[in-house]
Protein backbone atom coordinates (compact mmCIF):
# COMPACT_ATOMS: atom_id res chain seq x y z
CA UNK A 1 0.00 0.00 0.00
CA UNK A 2 0.98 3.90 -1.01
CA UNK A 3 2.47 5.89 1.94
CA UNK A 4 -0.41 8.33 2.86
CA UNK A 5 1.41 12.17 1.53
CA UNK A 6 -0.08 15.25 1.02
CA UNK A 7 -0.83 16.64 -2.83
CA UNK A 8 2.47 18.96 -4.03
CA UNK A 9 1.38 22.33 -4.73
CA UNK A 10 0.06 22.05 -8.24
CA UNK A 11 -0.26 18.48 -8.96
CA UNK A 12 -3.55 17.80 -7.97
CA UNK A 13 -5.39 16.00 -10.98
CA UNK A 14 -8.23 17.83 -12.56
CA UNK A 15 -8.97 15.16 -15.11
CA UNK A 16 -7.42 11.90 -16.08
CA UNK A 17 -4.69 12.59 -18.61
CA UNK A 18 -1.50 11.47 -19.85
CA UNK A 19 0.61 13.69 -17.89
CA UNK A 20 -0.46 11.17 -14.74
CA UNK A 21 1.99 9.05 -16.45
CA UNK A 22 4.99 10.43 -14.54
CA UNK A 23 3.46 10.86 -11.73
CA UNK A 24 5.11 8.41 -8.45
CA UNK A 25 2.96 6.22 -6.94
CA UNK A 26 2.55 8.08 -3.93
CA UNK A 27 2.19 11.08 -5.97
CA UNK A 28 -1.07 9.17 -8.14
CA UNK A 29 -2.18 7.96 -4.75
CA UNK A 30 -2.53 12.04 -2.72
CA UNK A 31 -3.22 13.78 -6.16
CA UNK A 32 -5.99 11.65 -7.96
CA UNK A 33 -9.50 11.87 -6.28
CA UNK A 34 -10.95 8.47 -6.45
CA UNK A 35 -14.27 9.75 -7.50
CA UNK A 36 -12.94 11.46 -10.74
CA UNK A 37 -11.38 8.11 -11.42
CA UNK A 38 -14.18 6.61 -11.45
CA UNK A 39 -15.89 9.12 -13.74
CA UNK A 40 -12.93 9.21 -15.94
CA UNK A 41 -12.68 5.51 -16.39
CA UNK A 42 -12.77 5.44 -20.21
CA UNK A 43 -9.83 7.63 -20.14
CA UNK A 44 -7.56 5.12 -18.52
CA UNK A 45 -6.88 2.40 -21.02
CA UNK A 46 -5.48 5.44 -23.76
CA UNK A 47 -2.54 6.36 -20.95
CA UNK A 48 0.47 3.36 -20.87
CA UNK A 49 0.02 2.88 -17.26
CA UNK A 50 2.67 0.81 -15.71
CA UNK A 51 0.95 -2.07 -13.70
CA UNK A 52 2.92 -0.58 -10.48
CA UNK A 53 0.53 2.69 -11.30
CA UNK A 54 -2.60 0.35 -11.47
CA UNK A 55 -2.15 -0.94 -8.74
CA UNK A 56 -2.39 2.67 -6.91
CA UNK A 57 -5.69 2.84 -9.47
CA UNK A 58 -7.27 0.09 -8.55
CA UNK A 59 -6.56 0.85 -4.56
CA UNK A 60 -8.07 3.99 -4.91
CA UNK A 61 -11.14 2.45 -6.74
CA UNK A 62 -11.60 -0.30 -3.83
CA UNK A 63 -11.52 2.19 -1.47
CA UNK A 64 -14.56 3.97 -2.84
CA UNK A 65 -16.36 1.10 -3.96
CA UNK A 66 -15.66 -1.40 -0.96
CA UNK A 67 -18.36 -3.66 -1.76
CA UNK A 68 -17.70 -4.02 -5.88
CA UNK A 69 -17.47 -1.76 -8.90
CA UNK A 70 -20.48 -0.06 -10.33
CA UNK A 71 -21.40 -1.28 -14.19
CA UNK A 72 -20.26 2.20 -15.33
CA UNK A 73 -16.51 1.01 -14.21
CA UNK A 74 -16.47 -2.41 -15.33
CA UNK A 75 -17.20 -1.69 -18.95
CA UNK A 76 -13.82 0.52 -18.62
CA UNK A 77 -11.65 -1.22 -16.75
CA UNK A 78 -9.04 -2.35 -19.78
CA UNK A 79 -5.84 -3.10 -18.86
CA UNK A 80 -7.06 -2.91 -15.04
CA UNK A 81 -9.03 -5.99 -15.20
CA UNK A 82 -5.74 -8.23 -15.25
CA UNK A 83 -5.08 -6.85 -11.98
CA UNK A 84 -8.60 -8.13 -10.54
CA UNK A 85 -8.85 -11.39 -8.45
CA UNK A 86 -11.92 -14.04 -8.31
CA UNK A 87 -12.58 -12.03 -5.23
CA UNK A 88 -13.07 -8.44 -6.28
CA UNK A 89 -14.67 -10.20 -9.71
CA UNK A 90 -17.63 -12.10 -7.08
CA UNK A 91 -18.51 -8.61 -5.81
CA UNK A 92 -19.95 -7.63 -9.05
CA UNK A 93 -23.48 -7.11 -9.52
CA UNK A 94 -23.34 -7.39 -13.80
CA UNK A 95 -26.43 -7.48 -16.10
CA UNK B 1 9.70 -13.58 -18.71
CA UNK B 2 11.41 -10.07 -20.74
CA UNK B 3 15.21 -9.71 -20.25
CA UNK B 4 16.00 -5.60 -21.06
CA UNK B 5 19.89 -5.21 -21.60
CA UNK B 6 20.90 -1.55 -21.80
CA UNK B 7 23.98 0.65 -23.16
CA UNK B 8 25.02 4.08 -24.56
CA UNK B 9 26.00 5.71 -21.00
CA UNK B 10 29.18 7.64 -20.07
CA UNK B 11 30.72 10.52 -18.77
CA UNK B 12 29.52 13.70 -21.47
CA UNK B 13 30.62 17.24 -20.86
CA UNK B 14 27.36 19.69 -20.64
CA UNK B 15 25.81 20.43 -23.38
CA UNK B 16 26.52 17.23 -24.86
CA UNK B 17 24.81 14.34 -26.49
CA UNK B 18 24.52 10.55 -25.65
CA UNK B 19 22.64 7.62 -26.89
CA UNK B 20 21.14 4.72 -25.02
CA UNK B 21 19.99 1.94 -26.62
CA UNK B 22 17.80 -1.15 -24.51
CA UNK B 23 17.79 -4.46 -26.53
CA UNK B 24 14.80 -6.47 -25.63
CA UNK B 25 14.83 -10.14 -25.64
CA UNK B 26 11.41 -10.44 -27.46
CA UNK B 27 10.05 -8.85 -30.80
CA UNK B 28 9.29 -5.53 -29.06
CA UNK B 29 6.37 -6.00 -31.45
CA UNK B 30 4.61 -7.77 -28.72
CA UNK B 31 5.18 -4.70 -26.24
CA UNK B 32 2.84 -2.11 -25.78
CA UNK B 33 5.04 0.12 -23.66
CA UNK B 34 8.17 0.87 -23.16
CA UNK B 35 9.82 3.45 -21.06
CA UNK B 36 13.45 5.18 -19.84
CA UNK B 37 13.43 5.72 -16.28
CA UNK B 38 16.16 7.37 -14.37
CA UNK B 39 17.17 7.72 -10.25
CA UNK B 40 19.72 10.19 -9.36
CA UNK B 41 21.33 9.47 -6.25
CA UNK B 42 19.41 9.56 -3.07
CA UNK B 43 16.82 10.77 -5.15
CA UNK B 44 13.46 9.24 -6.54
CA UNK B 45 13.08 6.70 -9.56
CA UNK B 46 11.70 8.84 -12.15
CA UNK B 47 9.87 8.23 -15.79
CA UNK B 48 11.25 10.17 -18.53
CA UNK B 49 9.90 8.88 -21.45
CA UNK B 50 7.54 6.65 -22.96
CA UNK B 51 6.70 4.99 -26.15
CA UNK B 52 3.32 3.27 -27.24
CA UNK B 53 1.98 1.36 -29.46
CA UNK B 54 1.24 2.63 -32.09
CA UNK B 55 4.53 4.83 -31.86
CA UNK B 56 3.12 7.36 -29.23
CA UNK B 57 5.56 9.28 -27.27
CA UNK B 58 5.40 10.94 -23.82
CA UNK B 59 8.08 12.96 -22.53
CA UNK B 60 8.16 14.18 -18.76
CA UNK B 61 8.83 18.13 -18.72
CA UNK B 62 12.02 18.12 -17.44
CA UNK B 63 13.45 16.29 -20.68
CA UNK B 64 10.71 18.01 -22.92
CA UNK B 65 12.72 19.64 -26.32
CA UNK B 66 16.03 17.50 -25.44
CA UNK B 67 15.17 13.84 -25.05
CA UNK B 68 13.63 11.78 -27.95
CA UNK B 69 12.33 7.87 -27.62
CA UNK B 70 12.82 5.65 -30.37
CA UNK B 71 12.11 2.17 -31.22
CA UNK B 72 13.14 -0.37 -34.05
CA UNK B 73 10.93 -3.50 -33.91
CA UNK B 74 13.71 -5.16 -36.61
CA UNK B 75 16.49 -5.27 -34.11
CA UNK B 76 14.09 -5.66 -31.03
CA UNK B 77 15.99 -2.50 -29.30
CA UNK B 78 14.34 0.94 -27.70
CA UNK B 79 16.92 4.16 -27.76
CA UNK B 80 16.40 7.40 -25.97
CA UNK B 81 18.47 9.96 -27.54
CA UNK B 82 19.56 12.58 -25.18
CA UNK B 83 21.16 16.07 -26.82
CA UNK B 84 21.88 19.40 -24.54
CA UNK B 85 22.56 17.64 -21.44
CA UNK B 86 22.55 19.26 -18.54
CA UNK B 87 24.46 17.68 -14.85
CA UNK B 88 21.09 17.22 -13.73
CA UNK B 89 20.54 14.77 -16.09
CA UNK B 90 23.38 12.79 -13.83
CA UNK B 91 21.63 9.34 -12.92
CA UNK B 92 21.34 5.57 -14.14
CA UNK B 93 19.31 5.27 -16.56
CA UNK B 94 16.96 2.37 -16.81
CA UNK B 95 14.69 0.60 -19.89
CA UNK B 96 11.39 -0.72 -19.31
CA UNK B 97 8.95 -2.51 -20.70
CA UNK B 98 4.94 -3.39 -19.69
CA UNK B 99 1.68 -4.14 -21.41
CA UNK B 100 3.06 -7.57 -22.61
CA UNK B 101 0.08 -9.41 -23.88
CA UNK B 102 -1.61 -10.52 -20.53
CA UNK B 103 1.47 -10.21 -18.57
CA UNK B 104 1.04 -8.20 -15.39
CA UNK B 105 4.36 -7.83 -14.79
CA UNK B 106 6.44 -4.05 -15.07
CA UNK B 107 9.69 -5.52 -16.40
CA UNK B 108 13.85 -3.50 -15.93
CA UNK B 109 17.28 -3.65 -17.52
CA UNK B 110 20.13 -3.46 -15.17
CA UNK B 111 20.70 0.17 -16.13
CA UNK B 112 23.18 2.28 -17.31
CA UNK B 113 25.41 4.85 -15.97
CA UNK B 114 25.01 8.62 -17.75
CA UNK B 115 27.34 11.58 -15.77
CA UNK B 116 27.32 14.57 -17.31
CA UNK B 117 30.12 16.67 -15.74
CA UNK B 118 29.83 20.68 -16.07
Known amino acids: EVEKTACPSGKKAREIDESLIFYKKWELEACVDAALLATQMDRVNAIPFTYEQLDVLKHKLDELYPQGYPESVIQHLGYLFLKMSPEDIRKWNVT | QVQLVESGGGLVQAGGSLRLSCAAS????????MGWYRQAPGKERELVAV???????LYADSVKGRFTISKDNYTNTLYLQMNSLKPEDTAMYYC????????????YGQGTQVTVSS
Open chain 2, 26 to 33: ISIRRINA
Open chain 2, 96 to 107: SAWRIGVDTTDY
Open chain 2, 51 to 57: ISSPNKT
